[in-house]
């Protein structure tokens, strides 16, 4: 699998589009799970809903959303509030039984928020009637990661 | 209605070489995954590998890998099993199964069969 | 590999019986559990899937039971048509594997 890189901006949403086949892996939930170490385990961060058919309700683990298109074929992970220990390589997986298969292998990187050295006057807060989701702007670039590129530093 | 329709009996020598296949019909053949499964003579079944007909993706039993060889041709809903090198002990019925996924716990089943290919290889 | 171990590996009963055949799987296998029929010279058959969902076109009298490691397969009443081999077979993991098979023999 080549590793698709997404880049957010700190403090603001990120979304995260994983496209799949979606005959291959009719009835079959998915996962969001974040590697840890080059060769380490997958740790789960969030799966869609248990039902299967229920798979396009979003669901929630603390800033982590998924929800999954299975007619369409495209499985949505949302970073809310993306800070730098976000940064890391994840998987998108397809669940049957107890296994996974990994739909596509993320690299995710948090860019420092521009907004950060200006005075606290140029910064823009929503009302109190505005929710502070609606304030967000979801912010995605990606690429794949060059041949050569290694998503972990190297161990000595 | 389904089925699966497997190439008939083959008597092989040993060192030879042979390809069985499975049709499918009567549904969307790229759209499930089609398995195969051993049953030596008077004995239980095992499962060898799958192939997802259509992008052709295989997992192969750790027991068959390297052993055998699983495809398929879309265009004409076939699946194929098939050895290089034949063996007294690949004496069996072989048999192909389509893999049903099961939206209630997302795992899947074999609920159609083909009939077998019974393979006996013999000097 | 999951390991899958039925009991017993045979038993005779009679036309209108009702008989529980056991699987054990070598680890938890939550409840990706199949069941399947096998008559002499035939392809075997779905009866349960997902340890106690009844396969479309099978009868009634047939149902499963069981999640982890334990489960069951029963046949409330036995009809003549019942008399075959049965396998239980794991759908958790690759490779997915099978029980020995448990014989139903007419006593």
């Known amino acids: 699998h080549n590793t698709t890189v997404f880049q957010g901006v700190a403090g603001q949403s990120l979304q995260v589009s994983c496209p799949y086949d979606s005959m291959k892996h009719w009835g079959r939930r998915k996962a969001w799970c974040r590697q840890l170490g080059e060769k380490g385990p997958c740790q789960r961060v969030v799966s869609t809903h248990n039902l299967w058919l229920l798979s396009f309700l979003r669901r929630w683990n603390g800033s982590t959303a998924i929800t999954d298109d299975t007619l369409g074929g495209t499985l949505t992970i949302t970073l809310r509030n993306l800070q730098p220990h976000d940064a890391g390589l994840y998987q998108c997986q397809s669940l049957h039984g107890s296994e996974a298969d990994t739909l596509r292998k993320v690299l995710v990187e948090v860019l420092a928020d521009p907004l950060d050295h200006r005075d606290a006057g140029d910064l823009w807060f929503p009302g109190e009637s505005e929710s502070f989701e609606d304030a967000h702007v979801e912010h995605s670039i990606s690429r794949s990661l060059l041949e050569g590129e290694i998503p972990f530093p190297p161990t000595s | 209605e389904v089925q699966l329709v497997q190439s008939g009996a083959e008597v092989k020598k040993p060192g030879e070489s042979l390809k069985i296949s499975c049709k499918g019909s009567?549904?969307?053949?790229?759209?499930?995954?089609i398995a195969w499964v051993r049953q030596m003579p008077g004995k239980g079944l095992e499962w060898m590998g799958t192939i997802y007909p259509g992008d052709s993706d295989t997992r192969y039993s750790p027991s068959f890998q390297g052993q055998v060889t699983i495809s398929a041709d879309k265009s004409i809903s076939t699946a194929y099993l098939q050895w290089s090198s034949l063996k007294a002990s690949d004496t069996a019925m072989y048999f192909c199964a389509r893999q049903r996924t099961f939206y209630y716990d997302s795992s899947d089943y074999f609920d159609y069969w083909g009939q077998g290919t019974l393979v006996t290889v013999s000097s | 590999d999951i390991q899958m171990t039925q009991s017993p590996s045979s038993v005779s009963a009679s036309v209108g019986d009702r008989v529980t055949i056991t699987c054990r799987a070598s680890?938890?296998?939550?409840?990706?559990l199949a069941w399947y029929q096998q008559k002499p010279g035939k392809a075997p058959k779905l009866l349960i899937y997902?340890?106690?969902s009844l396969q479309n076109g099978v009868p009634s009298r047939f149902s499963g039971s069981g999640s982890g490691t334990d489960f069951t397969l029963t046949i409330s009443s036995l009809q003549p048509e019942d008399f075959a081999t049965y396998f239980c077979?794991?759908?958790?993991?690759?490779?997915?594997?099978f029980g020995q098979g448990t014989k139903l023999e007419i006593k």
């Open positions: 997902a340890a106690s």
């Open positions: 009567g549904y969307s053949f790229t759209s499930y995954w």
């Open positions: 680890q938890g296998i939550s409840s990706w």
């Open positions: 077979q794991q759908a958790d993991s690759h490779p997915r594997t």
